[in-house]
């Protein structure tokens, strides 16, 4: 029977979401509770490490939300963004694989604001490379496991 | 060893983005630089040609942006849209497989505007069929390789 | 030859879209016309039933639209949302796998409003479990087959 293909579906660790409105790397993800799971990949310091060369489909879903009882939003015009980043350990370097998002005016007198971003793409990954997620305005992240997550699954070998 | 499955991840050719605000087919994509790659599929006149019958997962990520230093936006109410189109050569015809987008009012006095669209779906494709991308407001496209791209990978044979 | 892997791509049944602005489960989908198709899965009462244990990639694309000739929108601030729900029959329970959407102010005097949501993720599914789609404001759904759809394809076995 062929070796099981690598995959991961990682959900945000609600207890460790950074505050603030600047761009940050999200460094705490669940890998073994609820919908979160991982196989033949490694979660290390919030980065998803590739253990097996291959072509992978990568995806991320990031939800932002704000309720009027939380006070005003950080700025009039928000940039709600996600970046899926590949880091190479051997040659220390980071590059954006995918980005998505929207500018939003959440200064209106609505009780509740919400916005989700989804990105996905097919990438060649080498063992030792790591995938991480950067977001703007982390204090606005929706901490639910169905809201803020990212993942990968191997589709085929490189050669 | 089984034949490598077809795939493509194509990124926008920043040098060839059309101007204007009307719907256009994007006709220039990279296939061999940065994250762009192709195997057992063909890029022809900006269309992704299928060489092998199969069920494919298709996806597209399209980012639009505008900075105040670029002057005013084309219209007060923008329709920022993407259409993933299948063209059959044998019986000349085109059909939308997927669409996404949003109407936006970017006439406010914000320094910067941004919006991304992502679509994806699972489709039966036959050899000779072609996939292309149409967008509205091409002059607002973000030319970064992590922003504006589309792709496909074969998941399984038809029979 | 290995058994064909399960998949489905289901498009909204335009004739059966519920009215209203409250959250509803969409209960009528096409499985055999246009782009819609299904294999080794079952469509039952609007729910996609899993017949074969496995890890599946699930996705949904939901488009909302409004034209001024249809009168005013239900509320000043719309919550345009999608929820991808897993129901277990053996232990009757429902859980959200994925959600996405945005709050929108469609009260402006634009001729046309449009907004699309895309979500996707990798999940372990067991035979007998069912996937369904809930949306807010169903009366605003775009009934085109390229606009409002969901699907799944099996990526690998569980063991």
């Amino acid at each position: 029977k062929p070796e099981a293909q690598p995959f991961a579906h990682l959900t945000i660790n609600a207890a460790s979401i950074p505050s603030g409105s600047h761009k940050v790397t999200l460094s705490s993800w669940y890998h073994d509770r609820g919908w979160a799971k991982i196989s033949n990949m490694t979660l290390s310091n919030g980065k998803l490490r590739v253990n097996q060369d291959g072509f992978y489909y990568l995806y991320a879903n990031i939800c932002f939300r704000h309720h009027e009882t939380s006070g005003s939003v950080p700025t009039d015009y928000l940039q709600l963004m996600v970046y899926v980043v590949k880091t190479s350990i051997k040659i220390p370097s980071s590059h954006n694989l995918m980005k998505g998002g929207s500018t939003k005016n959440w200064s209106g007198n609505s009780e509740f604001h919400f916005y989700s971003i989804n990105v996905g793409g097919f990438f060649k990954l080498r063992a030792g490379e790591e995938i991480s997620i950067q977001v703007s305005n982390p204090s606005l992240l929706d901490p639910d496991q169905d809201a803020t997550y990212f993942g990968a699954f191997k589709v085929q070998d490189i050669d | 060893k089984p034949e490598a499955q077809p795939f493509a991840h194509l990124t926008i050719n920043a040098a060839s983005i059309p101007s204007g605000s009307h719907k256009v087919t994007l006709s220039s994509w990279y296939h061999d630089r940065g994250w762009a790659k192709i195997s057992n599929m063909t890029l022809s006149n900006g269309k992704l040609r299928v060489n092998q019958d199969g069920f494919y997962y298709l996806y597209a990520n399209i980012c639009f942006r505008h900075h105040e230093t670029s002057g005013s936006v084309p219209t007060d109410y923008l329709q920022l849209m993407v259409y993933v189109v299948k063209t059959s050569i044998k019986i000349p015809s085109s059909h939308n497989l997927m669409k996404g987008g949003s109407t936006k009012n970017w006439s406010g006095n914000s320094e910067f505007h941004f919006y991304s669209i992502n679509v994806g779906g699972f489709f039966k494709l036959r050899a000779g069929e072609e996939i292309s991308i149409q967008v509205s407001n091409p002059s607002l496209l973000d030319p970064d390789q992590d922003a504006t791209y589309f792709g496909a990978f074969k998941v399984q044979d038809i029979d | 030859k290995p058994e064909a892997q399960p998949f489905a791509h289901l498009t909204i049944n335009a004739a059966s879209i519920p009215s209203g602005s409250h959250k509803v489960t969409l209960s009528s989908w096409y499985h055999d016309r246009g782009w819609a198709k299904i294999s080794n899965m079952t469509l039952s009462n609007g729910k996609l039933r899993v017949n074969q244990d496995g890890f599946y990639y699930l996705y949904a694309n939901i488009c909302f639209r409004h034209h001024e000739t249809s009168g005013s929108v239900p509320t000043d601030y719309l919550q345009l949302m999608v929820y991808v729900v897993k129901t277990s029959i053996k232990i009757p329970s429902s859980h959200n796998l994925m959600k996405g959407g945005s709050t929108k102010n469609w009260s402006g005097n634009s001729e046309f409003h449009f907004y699309s949501i895309n979500v996707g993720g990798f999940f372990k599914l067991r035979a007998g479990e069912e996937i369904s789609i809930q949306v807010s404001n169903p009366s605003l759904l775009d009934p085109d087959q390229d606009a409002t759809y969901f699907g799944a394809f099996k990526v690998q076995d569980i063991d």
Epitope: - | H22, K23, Q79, M81, S136 | R65, H67, T69, F112, F114
Partner: nanobody, 120 residues
Framework: EVQLVESGGKLVQAGGSLRLSCAVS????????MAWFRQGPGKGRESVGR????????YYADSVKGRFTISRDNATNTVYLQMNSLKPEDTAVYYC?????????????WGQGTQVTVSS
């Protein structure tokens, strides 16, 4: 195929009035609605208002509501834009446009435009 030709644009004093015409020819039966747009100097294109072929219902942008009126003459297949209480900020090239289907995101047919200049 539908052809649209605008006329009536000219220089006018602030507070004055002007009527623009859009002559519609060709397959007029295919039209769903007609709209007036304008593009001021250094600005993007702005919707002024629309008239629907089926019932002559009209819709207007906030900036012109109460001052501008769209109408049509079935006999001559002409669409009019009556502009009253003109302001300097109404200075623009005015275009008429036609659409064939309700849910089409773009207008299918456009005129060449007519210049309106409002002096203070």
């Amino acid at each position: 195929e539908v052809q649209l030709v605008e006329s009536g644009g000219k220089l006018v004093q602030a507070g004055g009035s002007l009527r623009l015409s859009c002559a519609v020819s060709g397959r007029t039966s295919s039209i769903y609605n007609m709209a007036w747009f304008r593009q001021g100097p250094g600005k993007g294109r702005e919707s002024v208002g629309r008239i629907y072929w089926s019932d002559d219902n009209t819709y207007y942008a906030d900036s012109v509501k109460g001052r501008f009126t769209i109408s049509r003459d079935n006999a001559t297949n002409t669409v009019y834009l009556q502009m009253n209480s003109l302001k300097p900020e109404d200075t623009a090239v005015y275009y008429c446009a036609g659409k064939t289907t309700k849910w089409s995101l773009e207008y299918d047919y456009w005129g060449q435009g007519t210049q309106v200049t409002v002096s203070s």
